[in-house]
Interface confidence: medium
């Protein structure tokens, strides 16, 4: 920031200058001296503070003009002022020049000053209120003691009849829209009029012009008009100087999220410009800068309390819908059904969207990330979710082809973790990818870049390409441990399934039948004995367990987990023609987590003493922890289409109480 400037004196004449409080004016008395001058003395008015600086040493001038200094090339004056002027050019510094011993000056130079206060102010201390001239406003630091203002991307839609998010145009239609914006105040104080030839300008850089927008409310008392003054094609705005003490309130909106090549930081500047002569550019004599960080999009892990559960209504899922409704009624959240006119036959609501939120000290709201998958549910987020205080963001690849890995069953987030002393208070994003060197499917780069650029939930890439569908929610889930801040990682495990089945076989239940009561499937009489004796199935699942273990090791390393933090849920997979895995029976790990209530795919496992041994086993693992297991029949409406409960539902959750700006990424 420009905090010092030089003013050139001229003997025999008066020089006028505008001084901005908090800055230094330097002036060279030596160069301005008349011939024959050897010494100089100084006089100044009471609100002016003058120092004689020689060789970097400053001496305060506390005089009535009696003292004299030697004229020397290394002698300069440093001038500051303590308060704004009430009239233009009313404060002065007079330099009298003398020959060696003379008591009468041989000439003099005058500096006539107009002191004004200019401060561009924001909520740099992050308490929700704009403070005055915070010294840290021009920098941005993370952590509980961090400083720097925060900006929300204005990605909601306050006005229902408009097709897009508020940040997509340069208009403000309501006061509500201003509440999403961060306030910025330009404070000025000074005489009624500035001397001729000065101008105050707000401006942004070209590189920030597509990232930030600034509005000014004209006529705050009658028929407000919201004027767009900065952003997009508008790089600067001349501010009318009104004199006296003035505060101009501006509203600042973010236009885009942090991303590849954009850290999230934007700067806004105010400059006092001086006019020299016609056809000569205005020169800045003072600049004040504020920095905003655009709030990142934050995902919400399973351990956070649910607010709404979303599910699609299909021709064939009436019973499933009913069971989900019953589960939701046990919790204190609401069920939101996406009907057929909107889902158009697409049941995979988990894959279409990911719920998250954005937050600033003054405001926060949920924001849905729309996947590039764009199935028949593609209109749902814009038509049903985008609205007042509900934002929308999407990332679409330009050239890459979209694969199943771009669906958001392949996008999860862990609870808060600490890894080797480094804390991730908002958890870490988990995405599925291909095995290193395999050249397989990978989530599209634009989405990966977007997720990484948010900085607060550093992503971890897992290996999910071994699955037919290829989503991380097919082999892992997190559950809270009720009454504690701890959580458990649930992992699908083929070895746990074989171990359980062998135990049951050993106990004499080898002929226990799977898929009982399911018509065609139960007529095949799939028993424990048949499964254990199917050598190719055994081999396939040994391979699949290696894939699971690869992910287990990554998760332990990257989330700082131990074996005690992981519970294995029995699962079996069948290899498809591309040598990828699909669930043999409903995959229990693909569950919906609503606080302590778990909606688990009903596995239709072998019936031992009229009970499903898989359900019994899972209850035995989870219910002692205080979790309640509800098994939901998804076999005909979801499982047979290669998905389960989690794939067919979505949950909007409460945001973290932890403030993202308190972390250090």
């Amino acid at each position: 920031m420009l905090r010092e400037r030089t003013v050139r004196l001229q003997y025999g004449s008066r020089v006028e200058a505008v001084y901005v409080l908090g800055t230094y004016l330097w002036t060279d008395v030596y160069s301005a001296a008349p011939a024959g001058a050897q010494t100089f003395s100084l006089k100044h008015s009471e609100h002016v503070w003058v120092e004689v600086v020689r060789d970097g040493e400053a001496e305060e001038v506390a005089t009535n003009g009696k003292q004299r200094w030697l004229l020397s090339p290394s002698t300069t004056l440093r001038v500051t002022m303590s308060q704004a002027s009430t009239e233009a050019s009313s404060d002065k510094v007079t330099v009298n020049y003398y020959d060696e011993e003379g008591s009468i000056p041989i000439d003099q130079a005058g500096l006539f000053l107009t002191a004004i206060e200019i401060s561009l102010d924001v909520d740099a201390d992050r308490d929700g209120v704009v403070e005055k001239n915070n010294p840290k406003k021009a920098s941005w630091t993370w952590g509980p003691e961090g400083q720097g203002a925060i900006l929300l991307v204005n990605c909601d839609r306050e006005t229902p009849w408009l097709p897009k998010e508020d940040c997509r145009d340069e208009k403000v239609y309501s006061k509500e829209d201003l509440k999403d914006m961060s306030q910025m105040i330009l404070r000025t104080k000074g005489p009624d009029r500035l001397p001729a030839g000065y101008e105050i300008v707000l401006y942004i850089s070209m590189s920030d012009s597509d990232k930030v927008g600034v509005f000014y409310v004209e006529n705050p008392f009658f028929g407000q008009r919201y004027i767009h003054i900065l952003g997009r094609r508008k790089l600067y705005h001349v501010v009318k100087y009104t004199g006296g003490s003035a505060e101009l309130l501006f509203f600042v909106e973010g236009l885009c999220f942090p991303d590849e090549g954009f850290s999230g930081l934007v700067s806004i500047h105010v400059s006092l410009l001086e006019y020299m002569a016609q056809d000569i550019p205005l020169t800045p004599i003072f600049t004040d800068t504020v920095i905003f960080r655009i709030a990142p999009w934050i995902m919400t892990p399973n351990i956070l309390p649910p607010v709404s559960v979303f599910v699609c209504c299909m021709k064939d899922n009436y019973l499933f819908l009913k069971e989900v409704k019953n589960l939701v009624e046990k919790t204190n959240c609401e069920l939101k059904v996406c009907f057929q006119y909107l889902n158009r036959g697409d049941r995979w609501i988990q894959d279409e969207i990911e719920f998250g939120y954005i937050e600033a000290p003054h405001k926060g709201f949920p924001v849905v990330l729309d996947s590039p998958r764009d199935g028949n549910l593609k209109d749902f987020p814009v038509k049903e979710l985008l609205g007042p205080d509900f934002g929308y963001v999407t990332r679409e690849p330009l050239f890459e082809s979209v694969t199943s890995l771009d669906s958001f069953g392949n996008l999860e987030v862990s609870p808060p973790v600490t890894v080797n002393g480094k804390t991730y208070p908002l958890g870490r994003i988990l995405i599925g990818s291909s095995f290193p060197l395999s050249g397989g499917r990978r989530m599209t780069k634009v989405v990966r870049d977007f997720l990484k650029a948010q900085q607060v939930q550093a992503p971890v890439e897992l290996y999910s390409d071994w699955l037919t569908v290829g989503h991380v929610d097919e082999f892992m889930s997190f559950v809270p441990i009720p009454g504690t801040k701890k959580f458990l990682l649930l992992m699908a495990s083929t070895s746990a399934c074989y171990k359980l089945f062998r135990e049951k076989q050993k106990d004499g239940h080898g002929e226990a039948i799977m898929f009982k009561g399911l018509g065609g499937m139960s007529s095949k009489r799939i028993t424990i004995n048949k499964i254990l004796s199917n050598e190719s199935l055994v081999q396939e699942n040994l391979y699949f367990q290696r894939c699971l273990d690869w992910n287990r090791d990554i998760l332990k390393k990257e989330l700082g987990l131990t074996e005690q933090d992981i519970i294995d849920l029995p699962a079996l997979f069948k290899m498809d023609e591309d040598h990828r895995a699909r669930a043999f029976f409903p995959n229990m790990v693909n569950m919906i987590v609503l606080d302590k209530d778990l909606g688990i795919p009903k596995p239709f496992g072998p019936q031992v003493e009229e009970e499903c041994c898989l359900e019994m086993h899972v209850r035995g693992l989870l219910e002692p922890l205080g979790l309640e297991c509800t098994f939901i029949d998804d076999i005909s409406a979801y499982h047979k289409f290669l998905g389960e409960v989690h794939c067919g539902t979505n949950v909007r959750r409460k945001p973290f109480t932890f403030k993202w700006w308190h972390m250090v990424p």
């Epitope: 050897q38 005089t63 030697l70 020397s72 090339p73």
Partner: antibody, heavy 118, light 107 residues
Framework: EVQLQQSGPDLVKPGASVKISCKAS????????MHWVKQSHGESLEWIGR????????SYNQKFKGKAILTVHKSSNTAYMELRSLTSEDSAVYFC???????????WGQGTSVTVSS | DIVMTQSQKFMSTSVGDRVSVTCKAS??????VAWYQQKPGQSPKALIY???YRYSGVPDRFTGSGSGTDFTLTVTNVQSEDLAEYFC?????????FGSGTKLEIK
Amino acid sequence: EVQLQQSGPDLVKPGASVKISCKASGYSFTAYYMHWVKQSHGESLEWIGRVNPNNGGSSYNQKFKGKAILTVHKSSNTAYMELRSLTSEDSAVYFCARGDYLPSLGYWGQGTSVTVSS
Amino acid sequence: DIVMTQSQKFMSTSVGDRVSVTCKASQNVDTTVAWYQQKPGQSPKALIYSASYRYSGVPDRFTGSGSGTDFTLTVTNVQSEDLAEYFCQQYDSYPFTFGSGTKLEIK
């Protein structure tokens, strides 16, 4: 760091002369006057005069006119004071001092003791 | 010549006390007064200029005040290292003159 290094003590006979040097370092020599001050044993301080290092122009306390001659050598950043026709009254410690606020003396040399004795 | 009178040759004080050294000019010198501290066997050290402005590095327990003809150097919370002689000086007009000095003794 500003330093004023004076020459060592002198024992001189009555009627003789002595020239004391004061070498300045750590600042722009021509930007400050150099002052000279006398302190007789157990007495107060007396201002002798000052010299402008730019042009060698000097001003004296009337009492020391003809007794002290102040000069400078710009290229070596050194000021000199010559004391003439010495008597026992001239036995004292002599200080050079940089005139910060013109006559307020911000930095002092370590002093040079002059003893006049036969 | 302007005469600077420091009427007290000696002043006795204790560590932690507050002491005021006074100096009187024979005519009005406005605020063109400096104060110096001289410890035995050392050169004088500048403390105050323009009656009330501390030189950089001078502890804030040293305060100068006054204008016209009456000037005071006040030392609050006296420390043992403040044992020294204190001189005032006027530089309003030639020749510049010093007071006769006041010796501060620690009880």
